[in-house]
């Protein structure tokens, strides 16, 4: 299953399959997730070690048993790959690292006014993998405001150095935020020239293209089909690059197929997994296990559940079958691709779905009544769980926010439905940033069921929580995925990094905002909150947030939206925007429904509705 816990001051001994430099443990974990054999990782922050060569070291590890002995090492951080973790799997990494220089091949230098502009330039450059930016206060005047675009053979820095007034980060191409755009076409009977960066075996050009998309240096590819004239090159997928970023030449060639990486696609990237099953095909590799199962789909599920399994072959040979069950060969290789592909067999083959991020897998995400007062504009994919609840009567308008917590579930405030309990009038928009982008053609979800907490009463502030079951499940993308729910009765965690988002009013007597707003607000103790609201009962089922001096708060139209807090690199839904005295008034914090107190209710309702849980609190 999915294991998300991090181990502080611990280092896994042995099992090394690769090492690299990464700026933090989260990036190291992501590299482990996408490495075909990595199950565990250990990271050494700069503060944890004197050896300059091992600072920022990220060590990727494998283990036949799925675990390794942990040794104590002050400052080290260890953890698990996020393979099998569904919507948590993402190659997108938005963080900017201050005081750090990520080294690589500097291939472009320009003057820019901010680190955000530098990151944007990197994201819009086909070869840029990461960047460094010298701030206005950098010690050498001639380097100030320099934006250095970089790449390296492995896509990670060749070294990371602590350096004042330098900020570094990664391209946001894996976040589907590139402005370059991509070539979706696949070209039959065409071979591309240029430099081969890797060679793998794949059953078709689509798998070749997906592997290219997630390979750090692949810009385009050529695939040799299973009827290519040279037998030893059949099913070979050549991952390629060039100085210019495009093929310098292409040659008409029977039984070859070529195409481009989809990393520069805007708004949608292919999943990093291959779900098609190939009948009549055997995949060769190192044997992990052999089991008898009924049907090829069960074989694929078995492979997916066995975390080290990368691909499988289900044999239909009479000698491999007993009654209705046949042998399911679970296999792996060094690069995650078959070492041999044979056609015209009595088998069916395919890949593990451990890196699919759309599965019904329901663990929480680690990534990352309308304008927030004192907030700033959000960016694409920053709050992918935020939804807009809109009512269509004669006109259509935004009324409330909500949070996506599963493929078919949204959590919001009960008071959003006061006077509007009819599910037909509601339209739910997910994966959006600007309300003005919504047109008559914009897809929306309709409501199958509104479940208001049984103890909620109109005009009272208690139990202000409601679940919405959508008519159809939503697919997860970088811009539309769920927020993790807290553990039941989560009282011990001290949250210091909390944000409220919404399209609500920017002042008490304001109007709905176009761009999703965000504001960083500290939590306030219930005792402090009760002092500020002496006419109301602040219960343990509420949580308060706000600045003593006011100025930043949720407001009308933000209702039902999320109060999220980041803890150990993971976002959790701590509160649901509920009520407050005015907006952003001095010493009048916002009051939110405390989600942890309603976990039993949420799980009961989401399970009873269709027999199985659709979301889960973290492990």
């Amino acid at each position: 299953g999915c294991l998300t816990q991090l181990y502080e001051n611990a280092f896994f001994r042995g099992g090394d399959v690769a090492s690299m430099y990464t700026p933090n443990a989260q990036y190291c974990q992501m590299r482990c997730t996408f490495h075909p054999r990595c199950l565990l990782f250990s990271f050494l922050p700069a503060s944890s070690i004197n050896d300059m060569e091992k600072r920022f070291g990220c060590f990727l590890k494998d283990s036949v048993t799925g675990t390794l002995p942990k040794v104590h090492r002050t400052g080290a951080v260890s953890g698990h790959s996020l393979k099998q973790c569904g919507h948590q799997i993402s190659a997108c990494h938005r963080d900017i690292y201050k005081g750090v220089d990520m080294r690589g091949v500097n291939f472009n230098v320009s003057k820019v006014s901010s680190v955000e502009e530098c990151q944007k330039r990197c994201t819009s450059n086909i070869r840029c993998q990461f960047f460094s930016y010298a701030t206005q206060t950098f010690h050498k005047a001639e380097y100030r405001n320099n934006c250095l675009l970089k790449y390296s053979p492995g896509g990670t820095p060749t070294a990371i150095k602590v350096l004042s007034n330098v900020e570094s980060g990664f391209s946001l191409k894996p976040c589907a935020l590139s402005e370059i755009g991509c070539h979706m076409n696949i070209f039959q009977h065409l071979a591309f020239s240029d430099v081969d960066v890797a060679r793998v075996l794949t059953p078709d050009a689509f798998v070749c293209r997906t592997i290219c998309t997630y390979h750090p240096n692949c810009l385009f590819f050529t695939f040799y089909t299973n009827v290519w004239k040279i037998e030893s090159q059949r099913n070979v997928c050549l991952l390629k690059t060039s100085e210019s970023g495009t093929p310098s030449s292409s040659t008409p060639q029977e039984n070859t197929i070529s195409g481009y990486s989809l990393l520069t696609c805007k708004r949608t990237l292919p999943e990093p997994c291959h779900s098609k099953i190939y009948p009549g095909v055997d995949f060769g590799g190192e044997e992990l296990n052999v089991t008898f199962v009924k049907g090829v789909n069960v074989c694929q599920e078995t492979c997916t559940k066995m975390i080290r399994c990368q691909f499988f072959t289900y044999s239909l040979l009479p000698e491999d079958c007993k009654e209705e069950k046949c042998k399911c060969f679970l296999r792996l290789s060094m690069d995650g691709s078959p070492t041999r592909i044979a056609y015209g067999t009595q088998g069916s083959s395919g890949y593990s779905l451990r890196l699919c991020n759309t599965g019904d897998n329901s663990v929480c995400t680690t990534k990352t009544s309308t304008r927030i007062v004192g907030g700033t504009n959000s960016s694409w994919g920053e709050w992918p769980w935020q939804v807009s609840l809109q009512v269509k009567l004669t006109a259509q308008r935004h009324l409330c926010g909500g949070s996506l917590i599963g493929h078919q579930w949204v959590l919001t405030a009960a008071h959003c439905f006061d006077g509007l309990p009819l599910q037909d009038v509601w339209r739910i928009y997910s994966g959006i940033l600007n309300l003005s982008d919504i047109t008559k053609d914009t897809p929306f979800s309709q409501i199958k069921e509104i479940i208001i907490h049984q103890n909620y009463k109109v005009s009272e502030g208690n139990h202000d929580i409601a679940l919405i079951k959508l008519q159809a499940p939503l697919n997860y993308t970088e811009f539309q995925k769920p927020i993790c729910l807290p553990s039941k009765g989560d009282t011990s965690t001290i949250y210091t990094n909390c944000w409220v988002t919404g399209w609500g009013f920017s002042k008490e007597k304001g109007e709905i905002q176009n761009i999703l707003q965000k504001v960083n607000i500290p939590l306030v103790t219930n005792e402090e909150c009760q002092k500020r609201y002496q006419d109301y009962k602040i219960t343990q089922r509420m949580v308060c947030a706000g600045y003593k001096e006011g100025g930043k708060d949720a407001c009308k139209g933000d209702s039902g939206g999320p109060l999220v807090c980041k803890h150990n690199g993971m976002w959790r839904l701590v509160g649901i925007t509920s009520w407050g005295e005015g907006c952003a008034r001095r010493e009048q914090p916002g009051v939110y429904t405390k989600v942890a107190e309603y976990m039993d209710w949420i799980l009961e309702k989401t399970q009873s509705s269709d027999g199985k849980a659709q979301m889960q609190s973290p492990a």
Partner: antibody, heavy 119, light 107 residues
């Protein structure tokens, strides 16, 4: 030039049998998956069956499973569809088609042969 | 089995119009989607494979897009010879299934 030519269609009574043939030329027949697709009068397209290049793997639509058998003779560059226990709802134009390598689309189609099941 | 739902089932348009036909799969099919054109009494003709790749010899006014479950065929500048029935087909898993078809008629 790739060519596919079906034959063997005609009028048959319910419960009867027919064998369709598809002669292929202009490409390496033994390298390709081949399929049968049918189209009832005035209706849409329905995939019937496919066969792997060596003939070792076959699959069928539920509507014909157990009644139809797909086969091939690579030495004769010919695809076959043996249809038994025919029903009125099997009345259609039957097309043989080549499955394009890697995309599983049907890139070349025969002109079709009409099978009418009626008493 | 994967169901393919095409919409609309028919549409009337004029020469020069931009026409959009959509196809929705009942489960994710990645990019394994094909579009065909069929004229009355004729054999289906492959237009678009791999969701967006134009078959050789097909005019560039035809384009395909989408991945996962939602796909679109667009004819940017409808010509007299484009009046026909269009079918989508998933090639992700057997049974390979076709959409019900969209008949493009002259207004």
């Amino acid at each position: 030039e790739v060519q596919l030519l079906e034959s063997g269609g005609g009028l048959v009574q319910p419960g009867g049998s027919l064998r369709l043939s598809c002669a292929a030329s202009g490409f390496t027949f033994s390298a390709y998956y081949m399929v049968w697709v049918r189209q009832a009068p005035g209706k849409g397209l329905e995939w019937v069956s496919y066969i792997s290049p060596s003939g070792g793997q076959t699959q069928y639509a539920d509507s014909v499973k157990g009644r139809f058998t797909i086969s091939r003779d690579n030495s004769k560059n010919t695809l076959y569809l043996q249809m038994n226990s025919l029903r009125a709802e099997d009345t259609a134009v039957y097309y043989c088609a080549r499955e394009a390598i890697s995309s599983s689309s049907f890139d070349y189609w025969g002109q079709g042969t009409l099978v009418t099941v009626s008493s | 089995d994967i169901q393919m739902t095409q919409s609309p089932s028919s549409l009337s348009a004029s020469v020069g119009d931009r026409v959009t036909i959509t196809c929705r799969a009942s489960q994710r099919i990645s990019y394994y989607l094909t579009w065909y054109q069929q004229k009355p009494g004729k054999v289906p003709k492959l237009l678009i494979y791999a969701a967006s790749s134009l078959e050789s010899g097909v005019p560039s006014r035809f384009s395909g897009s989408g991945s996962g479950t939602d796909f679109t065929l667009t004819i940017s500048n409808l010509q007299p010879e484009d009046f026909a029935t269009y079918y989508c087909q998933q090639a992700f898993s057997t049974p390979f299934t076709f959409g019900g078809g969209t008949k493009v008629e002259i207004k």
